[in-house]
């Protein structure tokens, strides 16, 4: 059973001094969000049991293992149930306290009832304050009995519960008919899963037979002990004012447990520590009792005395819980009352008795759960004991459950069952997780989830190349932490897998699931330089650069071109994916921006130096283009152009530019300018005779603007063949020649 | 679901007897303290006598102490009402009702059809 | 043992908000807890109120209950009002002292 209590303050007197701890002795409990898990939680549970709202009540941890609630303000906001939740995963679990206010008008005689399943169970309602009236039984919350006020027997209104099951348990309450809530007598049930004395799936095992009132629980029979009381059976008692699984924990204050309520995990309960009873725990036991509640007798023989914290104290020459058995009687000795071994593994157990005569070798022996008995290998002789050792048969799962170490001689016999875990190592169920990668190294992440049994002791992360049949490379990790694979070669796929130990021999569970992690590929060390640059338009650069010249393959897939717009914060990427391009055009950039520009060769995903930058102007854009172009034929060597001004203009135009071809001619086209920019008209000169030409002009401010339409004339007929066009503008509006 | 069905009702002279059973089931009926209420034709409703689950404590209104016995067979989930010396007063839909508790307070929260009841000569 | 009275009609229109009283002849209305059962004609009673104030689940919240000291009285309130609510209405409380189930005299809305 999982190691926590929850312990309350009964000192009513004062509500703002009672208070709530939960306690948990397990390994690492509480510690939060880290790798064992959630942390204690230490809650009202208002769902069956509402009280009027009042302040928020205030939580403080005390280090990792303890919860303390404070911060009631009246005594109403104690009455109910709180619950305190501890320990990781599957053993996570919820220790439960109900609280029923002094001043009720009916108290419970006992508040919590354990019984087994089948049972009849009998909850006992003390009349406190009488009224005349019906008194309802509830159940979690919901009606669940009447009984008139007559039913009252020796001032007590009893509830038999006859057969009881599982799906009985819960919270119980009494209340009179219209009468605050805050009055009733709350109890709580608890019904083992199992019939008396049994644990298990189908109740098919047999319980160890827990002493001083410890509950065997059952699921794994195991006993869940008293406050004050320790080991396998709950046969040892702890020091007076201690408590927990190991009487680990000590009780607060100079009056040790007095005024303390414990409750323990299901089927326990809760109870007053050992050597204390009353419903607020502060009652002594009476001479002649012990215990939780003061609920045992210690009927000590042959002269012991009645401890009201431990049992009976024999005088010497005698044990036995009553002081029943002669010291000449052998007895086992400092027995462990749990031990834990690995599956498959061949352990030695050590069983060392005394007595009078002196038990040999042959007087002790060893019986495992399924009746198996083993013989002692040797034997160690001491002058006060002897020492049998075992070797235990490698051990299968079935090998859990209590064993027993028995002595016999002339003398009598004394037997000591201890209960033996065998463990699963633990094995992954998945493969670990690659993080990141380079050329030469793997970061892992090596926590996965598994089958089997923790806690985790070492992780080992086994890995080689793909393929290879090389030894396996081994690295031992921190379980928590991400582990990085060092001095691999690149490009390469590794296969990775991790194993899992846990504490003990033979704790190694097999490797599990291998995965492929491949590294990247080298970087390219390569710095290429930018060797120029030039403008071939508004959104047009070419750009080329040059690599040193190394000895061997060129390590690299290609180039990486990037063009930084710092007005704009934006970034242009061009990817050229030869490795042997040292030239790139670039196009559809911004018009008049200035631009830094830089290349990197790039090799898989991994981007080489890039070379030193290169700040680039480019030109703005021009304006749009002349609206409806016309030519005219005038002569055999002259055709006249008109045209409108560009719509939409984002500055004076400084001057025109005709293109001039002939239709179907393999030459160069000739510009020729128009320098007046208010000209919409112009006349070609110098023209052939008969010549189909081809026309079009664009405007310009800063850059040169955008073509306008292109249109045909021929000139006219058997002229002389003319040295080349040459321009006359017009000015429409002012009719000059130029 | 919650059923309560009645019968036993009929005619009867002054002075007669006669026993109604209350049938019930979708509940554990051993748990539930039973009333029987009566409504007169025309008139309100009024409670005739309860039962508690352990059926050894039974409460009856005035108008019929003494006449009138309240039963219980928590085996069969019945719930009876034995009516001795009846008298013209007596007519009436006789309802058997289940008692619940909500908050710490009784209601009548399921009621049977009725069963009419007519004393006449 | 006290008596529960209550008005033998009340009438309103469709839309509005009625209220029906239950006053106690002795005794103190707050020391019992009252219910509201309605009986529409030829149907069996169902509570739409219980406890003075709360509401099976079910009843709509048209239906209020609450309690006045000064007056003695227990008032069932509907608003809203609906065709469908057309009904006797009871107010129901219990004697402790002779275990009497005490009902009104019904009103007809």
């Known amino acids: 059973a999982v190691d926590l209590t929850l312990l309350a303050n009964l000192r009513l007197t004062d509500p703002q001094r009672f208070f709530l701890t939960c306690v948990s002795g397990e390994a690492g409990a509480g510690r939060g969000s880290d790798a064992w898990g959630p942390p204690l939680l230490l809650e009202k549970d208002d769902r069956i049991v509402r009280t009027p709202p009042g302040p928020p009540l205030r939580l403080a941890r005390n280090g990792s293992h303890q919860v303390t609630l404070r911060g009631f303000s009246k005594p109403s906001d104690l009455v109910g149930v709180f619950s305190c939740v501890g320990g990781a995963g599957a053993r996570r679990t919820r220790v439960i306290y109900v609280h029923n206010s002094p001043g009720a008008h009916l108290l419970p005689d006992k508040v919590t009832h354990t019984v087994n399943k089948g049972d009849t169970a009998v909850l006992s309602a003390r009349v406190h304050k009488e009224k005349q009236t019906d008194v309802i039984w509830k159940s979690n919350g919901s009606y669940f009995y009447t009984l008139d006020w007559h039913e009252a027997q020796d001032g007590r209104f009893l509830l038999q519960l006859p057969n009881v099951q599982p799906p009985s348990s819960g919270i119980y309450s009494a209340t009179y008919l219209e009468a605050s809530p805050l009055g009733s007598a709350f109890f709580r049930l608890i019904v083992r899963g199992c019939g008396a004395g049994r644990w298990g799936p189908g109740c098919t095992k047999e319980c160890p037979g827990c002493l001083h009132g410890g509950v065997c629980h059952d699921h794994d029979g195991e006993c869940v002990c008293p406050p004050g009381f320790t080991g396998t059976r709950c046969e040892q008692a702890c020091r007076e004012g201690r408590f927990g699984q190991s009487c680990q924990e000590q009780c607060p204050g100079i009056s040790g447990c007095r005024g303390l309520t414990f409750c323990l995990p299901d089927p326990y309960g809760c109870s007053c520590g050992s050597g204390w009873r009353g419903s607020q725990c502060q009652e002594a036991c009476a001479p002649g009792h012990f215990g939780a509640d003061c609920r045992l007798q210690c009927q000590c023989q042959n002269g012991g005395t009645c401890d009201r914290f431990s049992g009976c104290v024999c005088p010497s020459g005698w044990h036995g819980v009553h002081c029943e058995k002669s010291d000449r009687i052998p007895q086992i000795l400092n027995m462990a009352s749990e031990l834990e071994f690995n599956l498959e593994t061949m352990p030695r157990i050590n069983c060392a008795a005394a007595g009078n005569p002196f038990p040999v070798r042959g007087s002790i022996e060893l019986r495992k759960p399924d009746g198996t008995v083993l013989l002692s290998t040797k034997a160690i002789v001491e002058p006060e004991k002897t020492t049998a050792e075992f070797e235990v048969p490698r051990l299968v799962l079935a090998d859990s459950g209590f064993w027993e170490c028995r002595v016999s001689t002339s003398g009598g016999q004394d037997s000591r069952r201890f209960k033996v875990n065998v463990k699963v190592p633990p094995v992954p169920l998945a493969a670990p997780r690659l993080l990141t990668k380079q050329s030469r190294q793997l970061v892992v992440s090596p926590l996965v989830s598994f089958s089997g049994d923790g806690p985790i002791s070492t992780v080992r992360l086994h890995y080689r190349p793909q393929d290879s049949t090389m030894d396996w490379s081994t690295i031992v990790v921190d379980p928590s932490e991400n582990v990085t694979l060092m001095n691999l070669r690149p490009k390469t796929g590794y296969s990775v897998r991790v194993q899992l130990s846990r504490p003990g021999e033979g704790g190694e569970g097999a490797w599990g699931p291998p995965t492929l992690m491949t590294t990247d590929c080298p970087e390219p060390l390569l710095q290429p330089w930018l060797e120029g640059w030039h403008v071939e338009g508004t959104d047009r650069l070419r750009v080329s650069w040059s690599l040193p010249l190394v000895p061997g393959p060129l390590v690299g897939d290609g180039f990486l071109l990037r063009l930084w717009d710092g007005t704009r914060g934006q970034e242009r990427r061009e990817n050229v994916s030869s490795p042997q391009a040292r030239t790139a055009l670039l196009t559809g950039l911004t018009p008049g921006t200035h631009y830094q520009l830089d290349v990197q060769l790039y090799h898989c995903t991994l981007l080489g130096p890039a070379s030193p930058p290169a700040h680039v102007l480019l030109p703005p854009s021009g304006p749009p283009a002349p609206r409806h172009l016309h030519a005219q034929a005038l002569s055999d060597s002259e055709i006249q152009l008109t045209w409108k001004h560009p719509e939409a203009l984002p500055g004076p135009i400084s001057k025109y530019v005709v293109e001039v071809q002939v239709a179907g001619g393999a030459g160069d086209p000739l510009w020729i300018d128009v320098d007046r920019p208010e000209e919409t008209s112009t006349i070609i000169r110098g023209l052939n005779a008969s010549t189909r030409y081809l026309f079009r002009m664009r405007a310009s401010i800063q850059g040169l603007g955008d073509w306008s339409n292109t249109v045909e004339e021929s000139t006219l007929g058997n002229g002389l063949q003319a040295e080349g066009p040459v321009q006359e503008s017009r000015a429409a509006e002012e009719g000059l020649d130029q | 679901e919650v059923q309560l069905l009645e019968s036993g009702g009929g005619l009867v002279q002054p002075g007669g007897s006669l026993r109604l059973s209350c049938a019930a089931s979708?509940?554990?009926?051993?748990?539930?303290?039973m009333v029987w209420v009566r409504q007169a034709p025309g008139k309100g409703l009024e409670w005739v006598s309860s039962?508690?689950?352990?059926?050894?404590?039974?409460y009856y209104a005035d108008s019929v102490k003494g006449r009138f016995t309240i039963s219980r067979d928590n085996s069969k989930n019945t719930l009876y009402l034995q009516m001795n010396s009846l008298r013209a007063e007596d007519t009436a839909v006789y309802y058997c009702?289940?008692?619940?508790?909500?908050?710490?307070?009784?209601?009548?929260?399921?009621w049977g059809q009725g069963t009419l009841v007519t004393v006449s000569s | 043992q006290s008596v529960l009275t209550q008005p033998h009609s009340v009438s309103a229109s469709p839309g509005k908000t009625v209220t029906i009283s239950c006053t106690r002849s002795?005794?103190?209305?707050?020391?019992?807890?009252v219910q509201w059962y309605q009986q529409r004609p030829g149907s069996v009673p169902t509570t739409v109120i219980y406890?003075?104030?709360?509401?099976p689940s079910g009843v709509p919240d048209r239906f209020s209950g609450s309690i006045d000291s000064s007056s003695n009285s227990a008032f069932l309130s509907i608003s809203g009002l609906k065709t469908e609510d057309e009904a006797d209405y009871y107010c129901?409380?219990?004697?402790?002292?002779?275990?009497?189930?005490?009902f009104g005299g019904g009103t007809k809305l």
């Open positions: 979708g509940f554990t009926f051993s748990h539930y303290m």
């Open positions: 406890e003075d104030d709360r509401r």
């Open positions: 129901q409380s219990h004697d402790r002292t002779t275990r009497a189930w005490v």
């Open positions: 009702a289940r008692l619940d508790y909500g908050g710490n307070s009784a209601y009548f929260d399921y």
């Open positions: 039962i508690y689950p352990s059926g050894g404590w039974t």
């Open positions: 002795s005794g103190n209305i707050a020391s019992n807890f």
